[in-house]
């Protein structure tokens, strides 16, 4: 029995974290609000307290253990919970019972580098970060170029449908400056979603060799 | 199972100060909410003030500048003082968990104070 | 404060027979979370009270399912689908919705 007006959002990034989003239309500024974590099958419990990230919404992230820790598996179920200060007691705003697995976001690629870069070519390979071993190989990723004039909105995407850890981009244009940037989604879970983007990584072609056609 | 059990001075005369003590058995004392309510005789039910474990306290605007509830956790007791008393305050005091979802779930056997002179 | 105003006040019963009261508070008792914090509860002669219904339509546990609570905003209804000799007691209603929580004046059930 929550309210209509109220929207409370979970992601799992496969490890250790659950991020959360509650919003509520006409909800107070200054209420103190956090979201609560109990695990159906664990012994321990977990608080984050919510921040404000817009005028009706905010934001926290439960933090499980070790980044790399595997805290819950594929048959967990967690009850969350998001809780208001008032005076003494705390309300009960948003209830959910969570199901890691099926709420999935990892976090976003690291590690971007250049492997090696021509005038029409370049090779760029990243890691995957906090992901589960659970996972294996069954992981995509998407990517996209920025090239000079253009916004990140108007890059085509490029659909990685495998665990492939690097990409080669052709057909460049010689002495350009260049974005790159990859997100990462487990083929796993109805409510799945894409991991931010990465960290654009930026890289110049090469010059095309003097007295060459380009 | 819960059991609260409370005592505290039954006889008063007015302008003492009423002193009761409500102790938790057989269950946590954290995410609780621990109150005070009154039932004078014959009459209906008035709730006194209510505090959290970490000591965070709500008190009845009509009581307020008389009352003071205060926890003890170590113990698992809460306690109830309401000064310059009258005979109006005469009354059964009860002290009552709450929950999240419920004001008062666990009920104390209630003390009868009798304010005279 | 909230005045919580319950009806009847006296409520002579048959065993076997439903009964109800009613419970009509003078603010709107739903939070903006969804919940109607109101709660039901029986004093039976001698006794503290106990609770009955909280949330305005949630059994306690150990509460026979021949209570009920329903209702929602500012009226609120407690029901006994079939009164039994030891129901005899006052009932009050409670809102925990705006403090300071406050209590109805009670209704005394007693078997005719």
């Known amino acids: 029995a929550v309210n209509g007006t109220s929207q409370f959002t979970c992601f799992y990034n496969s490890r250790a974290n659950i991020s959360c989003v509650w919003s509520q239309d006409g909800a107070l500024q200054d209420t103190s609000c956090q979201v609560h974590a109990w695990p159906d099958r664990r012994r321990w419990n977990q608080t984050c307290e919510l921040l404000p990230v817009s005028q009706a919404s905010w934001a926290c992230n439960l933090i499980l253990g070790a980044p790399d820790s595997q805290k819950l598996t594929t048959v967990d179920i967690v009850t969350l919970r998001v809780l208001c200060r008032e005076g003494v007691r705390w309300r009960v705003m948003a209830i959910q019972d969570f199901k890691p697995f099926e709420n999935l976001r990892l976090m976003a690629p690291i590690s971007l580098q250049v492997v090696h870069v021509e005038t029409h070519r370049c090779n760029i390979s990243w890691e995957i970060s906090q992901a589960s071993h659970y996972f294996e190989r069954h992981l995509e990723f998407e990517a996209r170029t920025l090239s000079p004039g253009h916004t990140w909105e108007e890059a085509p995407l490029l659909t990685l449908k495998q665990k492939q850890e690097w990409i080669c981009l052709e057909t460049l244009t010689p002495d350009t400056q260049y974005e790159f940037q990859v997100r990462v989604k487990p083929l796993q879970g109805e409510f799945t979603t894409w991991s931010p983007w990465s960290q654009p990584l930026a890289f110049r072609t090469k010059p095309a060799a003097l007295g060459k056609d380009t | 199972q819960v059991q609260l059990q409370q005592w505290g001075a039954g006889l008063l005369k007015p302008s003492e100060t009423l002193s009761l003590t409500c102790a938790v058995y057989?269950?946590?004392?954290?995410?609780?909410?621990w109150s005070w309510i009154r039932q004078p005789p014959g009459k209906g039910l008035e709730w006194i003030g209510e505090?959290?474990?970490?000591?965070?306290?709500n008190y009845n605007p009509s009581l307020k500048s008389r009352v003071t509830i205060s926890v003890d956790t170590s113990k698992n007791q809460f306690s109830l003082k309401l000064s310059s008393v009258t005979a109006a305050d005469t009354a059964v005091y009860y002290c009552a968990r709450g929950t999240d979802t419920a004001m008062a779930d666990y009920w104390g056997q209630g003390t009868l104070v009798t304010v005279s002179s | 404060d909230v005045v919580m105003t319950q009806s009847p006040l006296s409520l002579p019963v048959t065993p076997g027979e439903p009964a109800s009261i009613s419970c009509r508070s003078s603010q709107r008792l739903l939070h903006s979370n969804g919940y109607n914090y109101v709660d039901w509860y029986l004093q039976k002669p001698g006794q503290s009270p106990q609770l009955l219904i909280y949330?305005?339509?949630n059994r306690a546990s150990g509460v026979p399912d021949r209570f009920s609570g329903s209702g929602s905003g500012t009226d609120f209804t407690l029901k006994i689908s079939r009164v039994e000799a030891e129901d005899v007691g006052v009932y009050y209603c409670?809102?925990?919705?705006?403090?300071?929580?406050?209590f109805g004046q009670g209704t005394k059930v007693e078997i005719k």
């Open positions: 057989g269950g946590s004392f954290s995410g609780y909410y």
């Open positions: 949330l305005g339509s």
């Open positions: 409670m809102q925990g919705t705006h403090w300071p929580w406050t």
């Open positions: 505090i959290n474990h970490s000591g965070s306290t």
